[in-house]
């Protein structure tokens, strides 16, 4: 699994700050299937896209979490994004609508860099963060950013902090991070590529 989770994350990361806020508010009142609880309001409103994805998956599991996310997006008028999310999750489950050929697994979202595509997995699985920081220091990361990432207590929190800077990066900056990943954890890059 994991594909539905990545698809939810993709969708939420493509929302503007205003849209994400609206999404959370709608999530507080959207009808839920019987047997499912609601994410507490206090926790929900302060979450970023990644935290919210984790919470949706932990509360509703991947399949229903993706369906619920698509419903809320549709309710917000974001039909295309909802459709993309559902297409991605259908693809992951091996089911394609009748008459439609499911795209090959390699047909990831065009225009989305590998590190964006696999953000959640990289946050969870990169262990050699210090090495990455040294490789990126001075090229992509300022001294202040370098120190901020190093100050985080765990590898996932370090990677999360590192990813907090990536929205400002261009494609080549992301490529430098990918190169560092290829050099330090090639097996992980290979594994993600196959996923």
């Amino acid at each position: 699994m994991g594909r539905a989770r990545d698809a939810i994350l993709d969708a939420l990361e493509n929302l503007t700050a205003e849209e994400l806020k609206k999404f959370k508010l709608k999530l507080l009142s959207v009808p839920l299937r019987e047997g499912y609880g609601r994410i507490p309001r206090g926790a929900l409103l302060s979450m970023d896209a990644l935290d919210l994805t984790d919470k949706l998956v932990s509360f509703y599991l991947e399949t229903y979490g993706a369906e619920l996310t698509a419903n809320v997006l549709r309710d917000m008028g974001l039909q295309e994004m909802a459709g993309q999310l559902q297409a991605a999750t259908h693809q992951g489950s091996g089911a394609a609508p009748a008459g439609i050929q499911a795209p090959p697994q390699s047909a990831a979202k065009p225009g989305l860099h590998f590190i964006d595509q696999h953000r959640a997995a990289l946050i969870a699985r990169v262990t050699n963060v210090e090495w990455l920081l040294d490789a990126l220091y001075g090229k992509v990361l300022t001294d202040e950013q370098y120190q901020a990432v190093r100050a985080e207590p765990t590898n996932p929190s370090k990677m999360r902090k590192l990813f907090s800077f990536t929205p400002a990066w261009n494609w080549t900056c992301k490529d430098l991070l990918l190169q560092a990943l290829r050099e330090s954890q090639s097996y992980l890059v290979e594994d993600l590529e196959r996923s």
């Epitope: 860099h113 590998f114 494609w171 080549t172 190169q179 050099e183 090639s186 290979e190 590529e193």
Partner: antibody, heavy 122, light 107 residues
């Protein structure tokens, strides 16, 4: 289908500049990097760099930094490479190429332009 | 920069032969290697990527193997249309670099 159409051969004088083009069709221009390579007579292939039309950012081989400038025009789906201060050493066939996938963890070149011969001669 | 050393630089073989071209990287490139074929007057054509993956439409007589610093391209049952120069390329780090090429001729 994916096509990369390059501009015609150029004969230029030493010290001059030349700008060669690579017009793409068959996919969304802003979704993929466009790479440039050259091949001198009786030599191997050399990677010059790439441009990502989505944000205009470019990566260069340090050997060609200052020699080559990569740009992209979204409105015409065309990538350009300008070569400056040309010498006879710059005489080569120049190729634009598109990777197999843009989002994967590597750049393998599955689609190539037909090549543009640049001859630098007085 | 990572240097890619190809050998031999030229090779003469008979139709039906199995031939092997090797590519040696100056440092570990894991599996990030591809092979191209360039026929005279033509553009390069991708044969193999990620060391051993056959690109769409490439005949199965072409195969690739290796990881780390040593890689091979094997062509079994050599055909007349295989006359070309073959190049390896590393995709591990920038700048991307190519081998010097192996020119294949028929005896």
């Amino acid at each position: 289908q994916v096509q990369l159409q390059q501009s015609d051969a150029e004969l230029v004088k030493p010290g001059a500049s030349v700008k060669i083009s690579c017009k793409i069709s068959g996919y969304t221009f802003t979704d993929q990097t466009i790479h440039w390579m050259n091949q001198r007579p009786e030599q191997g292939l050399e990677w010059i760099g790439y441009i990502y039309p989505g944000d205009g950012s470019a990566m260069y081989n340090e050997k060609f930094r200052g020699k080559a400038t990569l740009t992209a025009d979204k409105s015409s789906s065309t990538a350009y490479m300008q070569l400056n201060s040309l010498t006879s050493e710059d005489s080569a066939v120049y190729f634009c190429a598109r990777p197999l996938y843009s989002y994967a963890s590597y750049y393998w070149f599955a689609y190539w332009g037909q090549g543009t011969l640049v001859t630098v001669s007085a | 920069d990572i240097q890619m050393n190809q050998s031999p630089s030229s090779l003469s073989a008979s139709l039906g032969d199995t031939i092997t071209i090797t590519c040696h990287a100056s440092q570990n490139i894991n599996v990030w290697l591809s092979w191209y074929q360039r026929k005279p007057g033509n553009i390069p054509k991708l044969l193999i990527y990620k060391s051993s993956n056959l690109h769409t439409g490439v005949p199965s007589r072409f195969s690739g193997s290796g990881s780390g610093t040593g890689f091979t391209l094997t062509i079994s049952s050599l055909q007349p249309e295989d006359i070309a120069t073959y190049y390896c390329q590393q995709g591990q780090s920038y700048p991307l670099t190519f081998g010097g090429g192996t020119k294949l001729e028929i005896k």
